[in-house]
Interface confidence: low
């Protein structure tokens, strides 16, 4: 019968002919009366056999990532009779892996959006690197992820590539971060190869700022001839948030005379002071009212940022008009 062991050849071998092993018949007594032949894909071009001894050699550099195994056939013939000594047999040459591929991030570019002020531990995104080396061959394709840029705001789970928040961030201070992740094979041991990727992390706005009046005192005037409904001036607050988180509503907090009203212009986010009742210079020539401003939408969990509404004082002078 045939005698052989499992055949392995390391990929990327630089030797011109690398001895892989020996195929032989147990009827071969070593007197060169038998001839060994190799057939199949790669026979004669990638692999050669010593026809006398059955020793097999690789004569080309092999790339496991291109082809990981070769299935060949062997024959042994009695030179004197030309007859087969053994039935033709199939055997396998496996190409063993070396760590010749660096991890690659196949999904670039990475981009994620996460709400500002998210708590520590919040999942941002998972980055995944791929290594063309053999996952079953030692640690050649076992990856470890690490953070090269992004501390102290982010962390990465070493084995999964999951990026999490490690420190609260305020969009109003910085609205985007570039994080650089490295994937290293060989679980970081000597001889490891690495690849890096960048992740753009954008902070989305949450309503963590209340609107605040630009001025603590506004001075307005109104003619005593002004009809009710007249706009007598505008007041303005600012809000560091954006979008609907910066939408605000103005209202009267104090107006003993109940003469004025404030409506909100939702396009400009200004408060418009309106005359609710006609004024009479001779009766009262000035008024003092207090206005307040609040955000339009405030989720329950963010109420802590909106405990006391900002207020402002408005002094309104009535202008005299000659009466017949």
């Amino acid at each position: 019968g045939w005698v052989w062991n499992q055949f392995f050849v390391p990929e990327e071998m630089n030797t011109t002919s690398h001895h892989i092993g020996q195929l032989r018949s147990d009827l071969d007594n070593g007197n060169n009366s038998f001839q060994y032949k190799l057939l199949g894909a790669g026979a004669g071009s990638t692999f050669i056999i010593d026809e006398r001894t059955g020793d097999i050699y690789a004569i080309q550099k092999l790339d496991r990532e291109e082809r990981s195994l070769y299935i060949l056939r062997a024959q042994v013939i009695d030179i004197a009779t030309g007859r087969a000594v053994e039935p033709e047999s199939e055997f396998v040459i496996k190409v063993s892996d070396i760590n010749d591929n660096e991890p690659k991030f196949l999904d670039e570019p990475y981009e994620a959006i996460v709400p500002e002020m998210s708590p520590e531990g919040t999942l941002v995104i998972q980055v995944t690197a791929s290594d063309a080396d053999d996952p079953s061959s030692g640690n050649n394709a076992r990856l470890l992820y690490s953070l090269l840029q992004g501390q102290p705001y982010f962390s990465v789970e070493p084995t999964t590539g999951v990026i999490r928040i490690s420190s609260k961030m305020d969009r109003e201070l910085q609205d985007e971060y570039w994080v650089i992740i490295q994937a290293k094979d060989m679980i970081g041991q000597p001889g490891a190869l690495s690849g890096t990727t960048s992740v753009l992390i954008k902070l989305s706005d949450v309503n963590d700022n209340k609107p605040i009046f630009k001025e603590s005192l506004y001075r307005l005037t109104v003619s005593e001839s002004a009809p009710t409904g007249t706009s007598i001036g505008t007041i303005m607050a600012y809000d560091n948030d954006i979008g609907e988180n910066a939408e605000m509503d103005y209202s009267i907090e104090e107006d003993d005379s109940q003469t004025f009203d404030i409506i909100t212009n939702h396009e400009t986010q200004e408060g418009i002071v309106i005359l609710k009742k006609k004024v009479d210079f001779e009766h009262q020539n000035h008024y003092g009212i207090r206005a307040k401003v609040k955000n339009h939408h405030v989720p329950e969990q963010l109420m802590k940022y909106h405990t006391e509404a900002s207020t402002t004082f408005i002094k309104i002078q009535v202008e005299d008009v000659d009466e017949p």
Partner: antibody, heavy 120, light 110 residues
């Protein structure tokens, strides 16, 4: 554990269209391809097409070209498959299946299936 | 007519070893990873073997996959009654620019 939840059973008339949804959760929706596979009663599995939710890139099986449209909504982590000009032979269970981060990687999670019946 | 050819049926007795073959071409099995799916009656398919021979967690080591050239096979050793199901091979086809499934093999445990 990744979850794919599909919309409920539908009964349609020949010539009509059907739109099946597949809501994904517990993974980064924009990182993985999503395929649609159907199975007619008593028959084998038939691949219909694939979509990458982040860019909306699609590849459809030749057989369904012009009749199928796959879309994704990243805000709700949902993919949709719309099949038009329905005929009785479109009666099948339609599955969504999560692919890999590359087009040629295996489908590791499957939805529960949506039965679409086409009958006059 | 499926691009990948599987035997329509296979059977075995409990404890036996059963092999299901899947034959394709250079553009599919010859150049891409083979995956196997198990479909129990009335349920969605489940990934059984991926990238030729890898088992997802939870799949018993009684199931194994192999690939050679343009053919692949799924082996089930120590057959159990709960293995009665339909088995499908699937692979990406470079010529078709899409996925192809085998016609499926109905496994009966006698």
């Amino acid at each position: 554990q990744v979850q794919l939840v599909q919309s409920g059973a539908e009964v349609k008339k020949p010539g009509a269209s059907v739109k099946v949804s597949c809501k994904a959760s517990r993974y980064t929706f924009t990182s993985y391809y999503m395929s649609w596979v159907r199975q007619a009663p008593g028959q084998g599995l038939e691949w219909m097409g694939i979509i990458h939710p982040s860019g909306g890139d699609t590849t459809y099986a030749q057989k369904f070209q012009g009749r199928v449209t796959m879309t994704g909504d990243t805000s709700t982590s949902t993919v949709y498959m719309e099949l038009s000009s329905l005929r009785s032979e479109d009666t099948a269970v339609y599955y969504c299946a999560r692919g890999g981060i590359k087009l040629w990687l295996h489908f590791d999670y499957w939805g529960q299936g949506t039965l679409v019946t086409v009958s006059s | 007519q499926s691009v990948l050819t599987q035997p329509p049926s296979a059977s075995g007795t409990p404890g036996q070893r059963v092999t299901i073959s899947c034959s394709g071409s250079r553009s599919n099995i010859g150049s891409n990873f083979v995956n196997w799916y198990q479909q129990l009656p009335g349920t969605a398919p489940k990934l059984l073997i991926y990238t030729n021979n890898q088992r997802p967690s939870g799949v018993p080591d009684r199931f194994s996959g192999s690939k050679s050239g343009t053919s692949a096979s799924l082996a089930i050793s120590g057959l159990q009654s709960e293995d009665e199901a339909d088995y499908y091979c699937a692979v990406y086809d470079d010529s078709l620019n899409g996925w192809v499934f085998g016609g499926g093999t109905k496994l009966t445990v006698l």
